[in-house]
């Protein structure tokens, strides 16, 4: 059967919006009018993972782009990064791990952990227009609540 | 009121370890990345490394090769940094600071001065 | 390694006058930085984050400017209690996190 998706825009908790900035990131920023055009529009797909009640696993595309957020080591870090794919086999139901994210739902709120590096999280920063980051904290100055708006196919 | 309240003042000998402590309080300490930042006499700031309590990651200087070891302990919420191996030019006032993921260290503790000295 | 160079080295500045620092990244870190300001024998102060970011509890004669590669920071009216170093440091790429050598600030 054929994986699953649907259509999303993601918003942090302190209503900023992602856009792409460059060909390989996103930053989060504030948006207005007619300006949220800007947002980027995700292809959330339900994947093969650990789940439970609270918590599904799943890929974050970009809408009509062969990119995918992704999860990797650089210099030692666990790193959020955009990674290109071949449309030809992507989105599918088993997704390696890297490409992962559990969402969590708690309080009306989503967190989206790294499915490779646990207890690291899609965050932003307070600061305005800062690029979008694999942070390793919760509950402190960065960002990791976010509120989902489904845009129709 | 955020506090970072470090250990006392320590004179080793060469070849020998420290091991510093900051006690942090009035805030989440599993909220925040927390560094350690080194100051030689009559010298600059040098990053020396960082722990993130949530997750016990640890990343620090190359220059420091191994010697730095940095661990925390949340029920205390207090973060620990030793380093090992001391030569006279580890000689420093040692700070440690809480931050954000870009770095902003909006508190810091007092400082710890490490003599080594034969 | 991101360097971070700041000019100049000292810095002379007359009471009430406007004394500008200068922060030059290797490469560009967008508005990943942050300013400090250390006096005799205490820790350094976080003065300005973001670039151009205020600081509660930091007077307004303190300001940030700049992206990319080229910073600085401005103290619009000097006044005797600024006599410090002034350090920048990046957090655009880490590890390592990396400050510039300073600038000592003195009253001509």
């Known amino acids: 059967a054929p994986v699953r998706s649907l259509n999303c825009t993601l918003r942090d908790s302190q209503q900023k919006s992602l856009v792409m900035s460059g060909p390989y990131e996103l930053k989060a920023l504030h948006l207005q009018g007619q300006d949220m055009e800007q947002q980027v529009v995700f292809s959330m797909s339900f994947v093969q993972g650990e789940e439970s009640n609270d918590k599904i696993p799943v890929a974050l595309g970009l809408k009509e782009k062969n990119l995918y957020l992704s999860c990797v080591l650089k210099d030692d870090k666990p790193t959020l990064q955009l990674e290109s794919v071949d449309p030809k086999n992507y989105p599918k139901k088993k997704m390696e791990k890297r490409f992962v994210f559990n969402k969590i739902e708690i309080n009306n709120k989503l967190e989206f952990e790294s499915a490779q590096f646990p207890n690291w999280y899609i965050s932003t920063s307070q600061a305005e227009n800062m690029p979008v980051f694999l942070g390793g904290t919760k509950g402190g100055q960065d960002i990791t609540d976010f509120t989902m708006q489904f845009v129709s196919s | 009121e955020v506090q970072l309240v470090q250990s006392g003042a320590e004179v080793k000998k060469p070849g020998a370890s420290v091991k510093v402590s900051c006690k942090a309080s009035?805030?989440?300490?599993?909220?925040?990345?927390m560094h350690w930042v080194r100051q030689a006499p009559g010298q600059g700031l040098e990053w020396v490394g960082l722990?993130?309590?949530?997750?016990?990651?640890?990343v620090n200087n190359q220059k420091f090769k191994g010697r730095v070891t940095m661990t925390r302990d949340t029920s205390t919420s207090t973060a620990y940094m030793e380093l090992s191996s001391l030569r006279s030019e580890d000689t420093a006032v040692y700070y440690c600071?809480?931050?954000?993921?870009?770095?902003?260290?909006?508190?810091w503790g007092q400082g710890t001065l490490v003599t080594v000295s034969s | 390694e991101i360097v971070m160079t700041q000019s100049p080295a000292t810095l002379s500045v007359s009471p009430g006058e406007r004394a500008t620092l200068s922060c030059r990244a290797s490469?560009?870190?967008?508005?990943?930085i942050h300013w400090y300001q250390q006096k005799p024998g205490q820790a350094p102060r976080l003065l300005i984050k973001?670039?151009?970011n205020s600081i509660y509890g930091i007077p307004a004669r303190f300001s940030g400017s700049g992206s990319g590669t080229e910073f600085t920071l401005t103290i619009s009216s000097l006044q005797s209690e600024d006599i410090a170093v002034y350090y920048c440091?990046?957090?655009?790429?880490?590890?390592?996190?990396?400050f510039g050598q300073g600038t000592k600030l003195e009253i001509k």
């Open positions: 009035g805030f989440s300490f599993t909220g925040y990345y």
């Open positions: 600071a809480r931050s954000d993921y870009y770095g902003a260290m909006d508190y």
């Open positions: 722990i993130i309590p949530h997750n016990d990651y640890t």
């Open positions: 973001y670039a151009s």
């Open positions: 440091q990046q957090g655009a790429s880490w590890p390592p996190f990396t």
């Open positions: 490469q560009n870190i967008g508005t990943s």
